[in-house]
Amino acid sequence: HHHHHHASQPCPYPMAPPNGHVSPVQAKYILKDSFSIFCETGYELLQGHLPLKSFTAVCQKDGSWDRPMPACSIVDCGPPDDLPSGRVEYITGPGVTTYKAVIQYSCEETFYTMKVNDGKYVCEADGFWTSSKGEKSLPVCEPVCGLSARTTGGRIYGGQKAKPGDFPWQVLILGGTTAAGALLYDNWVLTAAHAVYEQKHDASALDIRMGTLKRLSPHYTQAWSEAVFIHEGYTHDAGFDNDIALIKLNNKVVINSNITPICLPRKEAESFMRTDDIGTASGWGLTQRGFLARNLMYVDIPIVDHQKCTAAYEKPPYPRGSVTANMLCAGLESGGKDSCRGDAGGALVFLDSETERWFVGGIVSWGSMNCGEAGQYGVYTKVINYIPWIENIISDF
């Protein structure tokens, strides 16, 4: 660093800024000598409002440094980002956002739960709010699924009127025909492929309503579709295998007691969907009187042995192999309780007695021409077979 030149003025001795130090330290600094400033951990080099990664000044022949001394300013992570459906609390002190400050994110109680981490973030030396796991991204407030006002457990035929909060995942799909769906998370709707097939290239034509019991009520939460994803194995007009679709909403819906997503089945869910276990279907489809229901209806129906169901649909007019391993059947042998036209796409739900949450086991798909017919059953898409498909689409889009 020493370059000896005659007749050049030494530069003023560099006084390190607070929370910084000069390197190298010399007795004097003459032409072309230089020094750098290094800040303590948690402090950053700033020249005015502009940040610097490094700072080196060089002594000029007029005896001045070529740059003014920077400041070592305490790192300020700035106000933390707002957490959708959550809030943030300053732990260190009101509005304190500097190095080592702590904040705590939390989600709105009852309807949301925190994913990713515990919500505690610290302002680190790099200037980013960082979780104990090292994440710099926000935690996620995920809607709590499967909450219902019903504590026990459509094609709704022979059903009862639903009460507020009974089926908060119920979605009414208009645009072509009347169909149904079930809310997943806060921006997806699970439905039957055949119910939305005609709109697959015109997603915006789907009029999606939720948070209401009355089919014709003007009081509902409106949602619009951004995209429709139909299972690639579904072939329209060639049976109902893979009769499943997802609708991505263009905005997240606000979760409350009347709008809550249904849970997807856990791996262990099959134990709650054995033959004779009771599922509940809900919808605004045809009732025993032959008209679309005005009020949301529901029916509790038992799962039917798969072989028995397969046999029921082996005889004409049904083609052989109508009932596949991707379907489950539910209904009474004596008839009278069933889902019906207009219920398509709705969820057949079951109570997981371990988590005390409702999950979707089936999607209303097809059945006999005469709903509720004795010896015939409602056929539902078996959702558990499609968990990877659902998860892939939701994570990719």
Epitope: Q47, H49, L50, P51, L52, R67, P68
Partner: antibody, heavy 118, light 108 residues
Framework: DVQLQESGPGLVRPSQSLSLTCTVT?????????WNWIRQFPGNKLEWMGY???????SYNPSLKSRLSITRDTSKNQFFLQLNSVSSADTATYYC???????????WGQGTTLTVSS | QTVLTQSPAIMSASLGERVTMTCTAS???????LLWYQQKPGSSPKLWIY???KLASGVPVRFSGSGSGTSYSLTISSMEADDAATYYC?????????FGAGTKLELK
């Protein structure tokens, strides 16, 4: 030689979002400095919008903070501006720039003209 | 925010004339963090003076800058035709960074 080059759509409809890209050559955006977006209105008034620093931290003009996001792609040595809910008042020439930090190191792009109109 | 007021807004000078324009800050600015830019029509602004008084590379020595606190100025000792342009001051002492509205210098 350090060069900055803005690219963008030229025309945006009111209420839509504006996205601009600044491609930097001759210097890595992670090496040092703050990488700024500045705009110049038709009457020639200049407004600093915000920056993203070498470390990825951002600082925004409070007048734009609710609508503005500056991000980067270090693998492509690019940084980006996104301005939401644009109106005719956002019609301007948009520049990306490194502003001198008390040294003779100051570079601006050529600017990209944006018109907001239906 | 720190408002920078430039005056005059427009001025004209003859060849060889001494020219001074000012930049007044609404609150004190460190002289280290005040810049001047020159801009000609159709071009982006060019750094002209940094740290109040240091000339950017390629800037003729007839230009000078001075000032402290809230009062800054740019002076041309002898106007030349190529100096006709708009000059802007900029402070980056604190956020947000702010520019003056500019002084348009025309050749008389």
């Amino acid at each position: 030689d350090v060069q900055l080059q803005e690219s963008g759509p030229g025309l945006v409809r009111p209420s839509q979002s504006l996205s601009l890209t600044c491609t930097v050559t001759g210097y890595s955006i992670t090496s040092d400095y703050a990488w700024n977006w500045i705009r110049q209105f038709p009457g020639n008034k200049l407004e600093w919008m915000g920056y993203i620093s070498y470390s990825g931290r951002t600082s925004y003009n409070p007048s734009l903070k609710s609508r503005l996001s500056i991000t980067r792609d270090t693998s492509k040595n690019q940084f980006f501006l996104q301005l939401n809910s644009v109106s005719s008042a956002d019609t301007a020439t948009y520049y990306c720039a490194i502003i001198s930090t008390a040294v003779d190191f100051d570079y601006w792009g050529q600017g990209t003209t944006l018109t907001v109109s239906s | 925010q720190t408002v920078l007021t430039q005056s005059p807004a427009i001025m004209s000078a003859s060849l060889g004339e001494r020219v001074t324009m000012t930049c007044t800050a609404s609150s004190s600015v460190s002289s280290s963090y005040l810049l001047w830019y020159q801009q000609k029509p159709g071009s982006s602004p060019k750094l002209w003076i940094y740290s109040t008084s240091k000339l950017a590379s390629g800037v003729p020595v007839r230009f000078s800058g001075s000032g402290s606190g809230t009062s800054y100025s740019l002076t041309i000792s002898s106007m030349e035709a190529d100096d006709a342009a708009t000059y802007y001051c900029l402070q980056y002492n604190r956020s947000p960074l702010t520019f003056g509205a500019g002084t348009k210098l025309e050749l008389k």
